[in-house]
């Protein structure tokens, strides 16, 4: 803060801005009668350097004249850019006690003189706005720094509009608030940039443009679609425009598109035809404007308008599969899954699925609607019987798919042979086949269908299956694999009136499952015993399980225990050995091995056998 | 294990009306699909009703429309509501649990409950 300069005065040569680099002499003198009180010739002018208020030097050191209790001068050289403070301070010497007190102070701004403006751009937005300009002003001149816009014109238009840049605002645009009009076309018009300060001043180039160089269309509003008969592929889109517009763009994609559709119109008069829409679709349009075919610059894209496309019937044909089991001594119950139509085929939301199943020789028919994806009967177990399912919306049907519902597994000649399944990676197993070797008719397809080796619901957990061509002898199947799961993978070879499948079973990934079977009995049966047992619990097989072995030794021996080894079979859950001698007493214990080695022991029997021995 | 255990039956004159009751106890997390069966003397077992998880329902032709199949999840519980009972409606019913395990099914039975419709 500076006081009023009461106590004198602070000069600045060659003036209080200078170029970059240059050097300036700051000389501060007392007014008369001023300064320490009792010995003038004690009076001691000191100068100091403030930076962003904060004191960064004292100039004593600097002084090239001094008048002995009355003024002095110093010289101050490599200044920053920017606004430097000086504050001349009066020291008296006799009187240590008393700080300096202020005398006067000068700010020195150090600056750059502007360069000329360059890359002048004028625009007008719509048909009734106003010509701005901007430029690139160059570098920064750290000084107030004031810039003019001219603009000339046919018929002695003159304008100008004026900004200035500081260090707190800058200046590299203006509105010259005046409208250009359309009758001025072909019109050439020039604008100039003129930029001065306190080192200097420049000139821009003059910039030279036409209305049609200038004038940017407002963009395309109040933007909406009209369907044709509520259809779902063709539609209008209707939009307002400034009167001189010639040239529309209009862009549209799917709202989940990463590409746009592009079309030009040309006097389009504020509508266009579409006619490759897809059907139930969420669509984004935006359209831009221009004014001349070949000069002149679009608009900037119209706000988005946002709609979904009408339904249509679906199309494409629904996959179906089915399960079939007998249920009593003279009926089957089928069940029909299928998949749901893709978004591109349904065509709209699907409100139900028309199911069919026809006895073909009687043509005795059963026909219902439903909402799910699966749909069960229970059929007479004669006959020849064919299922048909549609997919309808509310615009109708898809054309209905139709399978002939044969028995899966019948036909041994039908069997595909040399069925593997390998763990691809976490969440795939590859299935391959070769084809069977005398099918007595040609195959049509193959089916691999998968489900998991855990108990679930007939209805509730639908198989999953691959439709392959008939040339085709693998699969990799994806759908629902999860982990440390065992799941049965059937490959069916289907003909027209026969079905024929090989099984195998088949893991992602595997481990050593968690623990051994829990064995619930040993029974004596003709000099045999016979081990029995419940399958370790599903989450605990981590894979699919290969073999269990049955370990025994006699109850207090060291020796290594003998063991029998035997193909895991989910049905069986017991298992003869003949080999322990009798009125021994044995332990017995059982392990379970997957791919990736085995369980822990599960729990230990005691038995000792009473027959002979074998 | 799956244990079920009907209950209900009964003596009842021709056009009256029964409801057998099943419950399912033990490890029936993966049994949605139900069913009744019969076995009249001298007979095979018939199937009679099933409802699926999604409580979708099919009937024998000759009781469609006389008897109504229904459960309720919370109690575990699967019914049978015959009415307009008929004499070759005479057996013992049988609650049936089917549940799937990769192609193999596995089914659980009832000891049964007789229903006598007399003339």
């Known amino acids: 803060n500076i006081d009023v300069c009461k106590l004198g005065t602070v000069t600045v040569q060659p003036a209080p801005v200078i170029p970059l680099g240059s050097a300036a002499n700051i000389s501060c003198s007392l007014n008369p009668k001023q300064g320490c009180s009792h010995y003038p010739s004690s009076n001691e002018l000191i100068l100091l350097k403030f930076v962003n208020d904060v004191l960064v030097e004292n100039l004593h050191g600097k002084k090239v004249h001094d008048h002995t209790g009355h003024s002095s001068t110093f010289q101050v050289t490599n200044l920053s850019l920017g606004m430097t403070l000086f504050v001349c301070k009066l020291n008296c010497s006799n009187s240590q006690k008393k700080p300096p007190v202020p005398v006067c102070g000068v700010e020195i701004s150090v600056g750059v003189a502007p360069e000329p403006p360059q890359n002048i751009s004028c625009v007008q937005e719509g048909e009734n706005g106003t010509v701005a300009c901007s430029w690139n002003s160059g570098k920064v001149t750290y000084l107030k720094t004031n810039y003019t816009l001219q603009l000339s014109g046919p018929n002695n238009l003159t304008c100008q509009k004026q900004c200035f840049s500081d260090n707190r605002q800058n200046c590299n645009r203006l509105d010259l608030g005046i409208n250009l009009s359309p009758d001025l076309a072909e019109s050439r018009f020039i604008v100039r940039v003129t930029a001065i300060n306190d080192l200097g001043n420049s000139s821009s180039l003059p910039h030279t443009f036409t209305f049609l160089d200038i004038v940017i269309p407002l963009p395309p509003w109040d933007i909406r679609i009209n369907f044709l008969n509520a259809s779902g592929s063709r539609g209008t889109l209707q939009w307002e425009d400034e009167g001189q517009v010639v040239l529309n763009q209009l862009r549209y994609q799917p709202l989940n598109s990463t590409s746009w559709n592009m079309v030009n119109a040309t006097n389009a008069k504020g509508k266009y035809d579409l006619r490759d829409l897809r059907p139930f679709t969420e669509y984004e349009f935006q359209i831009s404007s221009k004014l001349h075919l070949s000069g002149g610059s679009w608009s900037n894209w119209s706000e988005s308008l946002r709609t979904r496309t009408p339904e249509e019937e679906p199309v494409g044909i629904l996959d179906i599969w089915y399960m079939k089991q007998d249920i009593d001594y003279d009926r089957q119950q089928i069940s029909l899954f299928w998949k749901s139509l893709n978004p591109s085929e349904a065509r709209g939301k699907i409100l139900h699925y028309q199911v069919t199943l026809q006895e073909v020789t009687k043509k005795t028919t059963l026909q219902n609607t439903t909402r799910h994806t699966s749909w069960t009967r229970v059929i007479p177990r004669t006959g020849a019987w064919t299922a048909s399912v549609s997919a309808a919306n509310s615009k109708g049907a898809s054309a209905p798919t139709h399978i002939n519902i044969v028995d899966l597994c019948g036909t041994g000649l039908l069997a595909p042979h040399q069925v593997s399944a390998k763990s691809e990676n976490m969440d795939n197993i590859l299935v391959t086949w070769q084809p069977p070797k005398k099918a007595d008719s040609a195959v049509r397809e193959y089916i691999v269908e998968w489900r998991a080796l855990q108990p679930g619901s007939i209805t509730k957990f639908p198989p999953h299956w691959l439709r392959i061509p008939p040339d085709n002898m693998s699969a990799l199947i994806s759908e629902n694999i999860k982990p440390y799961i065992c799941y049965e993978i059937r490959v069916h070879a289907l003909s027209e009136s026969q079905g024929g499948c090989s099984s195998i079973r088949g893991d992602s990934k595997h481990k050593a499952p968690v623990s051994g079977p829990h064995i619930t009995a040993i029974t004596e049966k003709k000099e045999r015993l016979f081990i029995s047992w419940t399958h370790i619990p599903f989450p605990e097989q981590r894979g699919c399980i290969l073999h269990y072995r049955i370990y025994w030794k006699e109850r207090d021996s060291t020796a290594q225990p003998e063991l029998c080894e035997i193909q895991y079979r989910r049905s069986q859950n017991s298992h003869p050995i003949s080999s322990l001698q009798p009125r021994v007493t044995y332990v017995l214990w059982m392990t379970a091995v997957t791919a990736a080695g085995e369980s822990p022991q599960g729990n230990e029997r005691e038995f000792c056998p009473q027959g002979k021995a074998n | 294990q799956v244990q079920l255990q009907e209950s209900g039956g009964g003596l009842v004159q021709a056009g009256g009306s029964l409801r057998l009751f099943c419950t399912a106890s033990?490890?029936?997390?993966?049994?949605?699909?139900m069913y009744w069966y019969r076995q009249a003397p001298g007979k095979q077992r018939e199937f009679v009703a099933y409802?699926?998880?999604?409580?979708?329902?099919n009937y024998l032709d000759s009781v469609n429309g006389r008897f109504t199949i229904s459960r309720d999840n919370a109690k575990n519980s699967v019914y049978l509501q015959m009415n307009s009972l008929k004499p070759e409606d005479t057996a013992v019913y049988y609650c049936?649990?089917?549940?799937?395990?990769?192609?193999?099914?596995?089914?659980?039975w009832g000891q049964g409950t007789q229903v006598t419709v007399s003339s």
């Open positions: 049936n649990a089917k549940q799937i395990v990769g192609f193999q099914i596995d089914e659980y």
């Open positions: 033990g490890s029936i997390f993966a049994i949605d699909d």
């Open positions: 409802i699926t998880a999604t409580n979708s329902a």
